[in-house]
């Protein structure tokens, strides 16, 4: 069941998922000057069964200028560099090791992909938050949000995270020095 809305926004933070539950959609978005090809699904879908899940459909982008030409994509990892910081890339390597039943890993990039990935998450999905570069994390609790179903409606739990500039006081009175992100957090794609 799809979550009705997007995960909460935290100022100066991005959220990511370690793995994606079956039923998750990833919109096939293209960078400026390119558009999704006219045939093929508008999104990729995490599909499968409890033992094996994978992304169904392939996103393809074609030049907006040459409307009639379509380009078969071969994922090019170098396309990622304009979308991820070095820190995120190192976290990605951890995510690649994750294999949860009924979940998909981060799909590889496609040629001329947009800079931001737009996911439609499903109930039960957890996303993890991390402060952007130059900001420190102050934790009052878990820096994560879970999409839950209550009374027939979906809602995201509120992550207990505040991101503060390096020059500001970096911790609440009486708290220990906070970590930049939850211990050993395997991050995946940026989503906001």
């Amino acid at each position: 069941e799809l979550c009705d809305d997007d995960p909460p926004k935290i100022t100066h933070a991005t959220f990511k998922a370690v793995a994606y539950k079956e039923g998750t959609m990833l919109n096939c978005e293209c960078k400026r000057g390119f558009r999704r090809i006219k045939s093929g699904s508008p999104y990729m879908l995490c599909t499968g069964n409890s033992s094996h899940s994978s992304w169904d459909n392939q996103c393809q982008c074609t030049s907006s200028a040459a409307r009639n030409t379509t380009k078969q994509v071969t994922p090019q990892p170098e396309e990622q560099k304009e979308r991820k910081t070095t820190e995120m890339q190192s976290q990605m390597q951890l995510a690649d090791q994750v294999s949860l039943p009924g979940h998909c890993r981060e799909p590889p990039p496609w040629e001329n992909e947009a800079t931001e990935r737009i996911y439609h998450f499903v109930v039960g999905q957890t996303v993890y938050y991390q402060c952007v570069q130059g900001y420190r994390a102050l934790h009052r609790g878990p820096a994560e949000s879970v999409c839950k179903m209550t009374h027939g409606k979906t809602r995201w739990t509120q992550p207990q995270l505040i991101c503060t500039g390096e020059t500001e006081p970096s911790q609440f009175p009486g708290e220990e020095e906070p970590q930049a992100s939850p211990d050993g957090l395997p991050e995946s794609e940026t989503s906001r």
């Epitope: 799809l2 400026r32 699904s41 999104y43 599909t47 459909n57 947009a114 737009i118």
Partner: antibody, heavy 114, light 107 residues
Framework: QVQLQQPGAELVRPGTSVKMSCKAA????????IGWVKQRPGHGLEWIGD????????NYNEKFKGKATLTADTSSSTAYMNLSSLTSEDSAIYYC???????WGQGTLVTVSA | DVVMTQTQKFTSTSVGDRVSVTCKAS??????VAWYQQKPGQSPKALIY???YRYSGVPDRFTGSGSGTDFTLTISNVQSEDLAEYFC?????????FGGGTKLEIK
């Protein structure tokens, strides 16, 4: 809560044009395509086209090219559809949809009458 | 254009029964099919995406199945509030197209 607000009705003269709105709320407007669908009794549902407010891309059903023009105003999170050279065939309910058709507006009833 | 055919214009059932609504695509559309429910005087409501995945808030008595060209929406334990018209839609290629609809009547 995701909402797509559309005006209830528009009464217009033949040969003129009408611009209907679809105001989005409860999600990031520039992230998702807005689609438009026509419904006429006995004709079922017809997809007119869609627009990506973030990139300002649009796609049209060939049948509606020259008839419909899709635009979006990101500052007000509102999508618009302009229908030109109206005839009785254009009398219908027009729905806007978003987030891969998960959400639909209440529809605007367009009546073309002299 | 891909033609989506719903051969049954009407189907009649009783409360508590199980009913199936079928849809046939004129060419392979993979699993890129959605189902919608439209009650009289209301806008369509999304029930199923990607042929078999339910949207949130949709009762689990609604089940979608199929791939390629043949698709089915099954309603088990039909309730009186299921009285509506049901449409299939393909979004595998532009222009997206809908089936003609099947009206569910409750005996």
């Amino acid at each position: 809560q995701v909402q797509l607000q559309q005006p209830g009705a528009e009464l217009v003269r033949p040969g003129t044009s009408v611009k209907m709105s679809c105001k989005a709320a409860g999600y990031t407007f520039t992230n998702y395509w807005i689609g438009w669908v026509k419904q006429r009794p006995g004709h079922g549902l017809e997809w007119i086209g869609d627009i990506h407010p973030g990139g300002d891309y649009s796609n049209y059903n060939e049948k509606f090219k020259g008839k419909a023009t899709l635009t979006a105003d990101t500052s007000s999170s509102t999508a618009y559809m302009n229908l030109s050279s109206l005839t009785s065939e254009d009398s219908a309910i027009y729905y806007c949809t978003s987030r891969n058709f998960a959400y639909w507006g209440q529809g605007t009833l367009v009546t073309v009458s002299a | 254009d891909v033609v989506m055919t719903q051969t049954q214009k009407f189907t009649s059932t009783s409360v508590g029964d199980r009913v199936s609504v079928t849809c046939k695509a004129s060419q392979n559309v993979g699993t890129n099919v959605a189902w919608y429910q439209q009650k009289p005087g209301q806008s369509p409501k999304a029930l199923i995406y990607s042929a078999s995945y339910r949207y949130s808030g949709v009762p689990d008595r609604f089940t979608g199945s199929g791939s390629g060209t043949d698709f089915t929406l099954t309603i088990s334990n039909v309730q009186s509030e299921d009285l509506a018209e049901y449409f299939c839609q393909q979004y595998n290629s532009y222009p997206y197209t809908f089936g003609g609809g099947t009206k569910l009547e409750i005996k």
